[in-house]
């Protein structure tokens, strides 16, 4: 376990070779979650990346939030994508934390503190709990079959995730640098291991 | 075994409209997004659009926006495209595909249009 507070990993060109696995302690099925992080590339106006990739051996789309070109957010929870527009992309870290719950299907999604449009998926769903959980690739089988196309260019950090839906307070209370305890996956508790050329360097937001 | 099968080929008159059909089956069809793709001779793949057959919702790219309606049916696991105000830049092969905007894993045989008067 390494504490990363105030850290970031750094992917710093194109490769289909280079990603971060994070290792989770889950027992069970999720019938909910949230995801938290920051991340900064140059991208975003050039062409799609991965921002987050779970995936388990059933399927390799269990959850991923992907920026897509010309249309913003990707989100997918067990092969089923919604998509939050974003018309205009600006280069700065941005901070994301997505939910979902599986009894209503209801997703969130905040991008900076500001939330969207709440929209639904896979009401009823449950996500898988073997689950290999990538950053800086978009797993098309489990734990690889990477494109280069799709790899993260830049810093990504503040990964946090639990096993239910925060409340809009909390996940205010994040954005602004507030105390909380994640329960999946723990940035300043991160189990982790680096394959290729990322870096860990102090993070850039503040 | 995973099947998309599209609808055959339609030759129309410009300024008429076309409903082309994709019928999913060998698996639940409101697990995956259908997705609608554009391919003119000797041009790359052009994205139209997708539904979601769970949740109804649409989207459709810029390009697309009042030129294709997309809909389904979950009762006959089938997706529809309409396209409205066929001009002759509108002949081309359209695809379905079942997936998301990251990948799509299953993709129909085409359906041929050819706008002529």
């Known amino acids: 376990q390494t504490d990363m507070s105030r850290k970031a990993f750094v992917f710093p060109k194109e490769s289909d070779t280079s990603y971060v696995s994070l290792k989770a302690p889950l027992t069970k099925p999720l019938k909910a979650f949230t995801v938290c992080l920051h991340f900064y590339t140059e991208l975003s106006s050039t062409r799609g990346y991965s921002i987050f990739s779970y995936a388990t051996k059933r399927q390799d789309n269990e959850i991923l939030i992907f920026w897509s070109k010309d249309i913003g957010y990707s989100f997918t929870v067990g092969g089923s994508e919604i998509l939050f527009e974003v018309p205009e992309v600006t280069v700065a870290p941005v901070h994301i934390c997505t939910s979902w719950e599986s009894a209503s299907g209801i997703v969130e999604f905040w991008v900076d503190g500001k939330p969207r449009v709440r929209k639904s998926l896979k009401k009823g769903y449950t996500v898988g709990a073997e689950a290999s959980i990538i950053l800086g690739q978009e797993q098309d089988s489990f734990g690889g079959n990477f494109e280069g196309s799709q790899s993260l260019v830049g810093d990504i950090g503040n990964v946090n995730m639990w096993d239910f839906v925060l409340s809009p307070d909390e996940i205010n209370t994040i954005y602004l640098g507030g105390p909380f305890s994640p329960n999946v996956l723990n940035w300043r508790a991160l189990k982790y291991e680096v394959q290729g050329e990322v870096f860990t360097k102090p993070q850039l937001w503040p | 075994e995973v099947q998309l099968q599209q609808s055959g080929p339609e030759v129309l008159k410009p300024g008429t409209s076309v409903r082309m059909s994709c019928k999913a089956s060998?698996?639940?069809?409101?697990?995956?997004?259908i997705h609608w793709v554009k391919q003119s001779r000797g041009e790359s793949l052009e994205w139209i659009g997708f539904?979601?057959?769970?949740?109804?919702?649409?989207y459709y790219y810029k390009n697309f926006k009042g030129k294709a309606t997309l809909t389904f049916n979950r009762s006959s696991s089938t997706a529809y495209m309409d396209l409205r105000s066929l001009t002759s830049e509108d002949s081309a092969v359209y695809y379905c595909a079942r997936g998301t905007t990251v990948e799509k894993d299953y993709w129909g045989q085409g359906t041929i249009l050819t706008v002529s008067s």
């Open positions: 060998g698996y639940t069809f409101t697990d995956y997004n």
């Open positions: 539904v979601n057959p769970d949740t109804g919702d649409t």
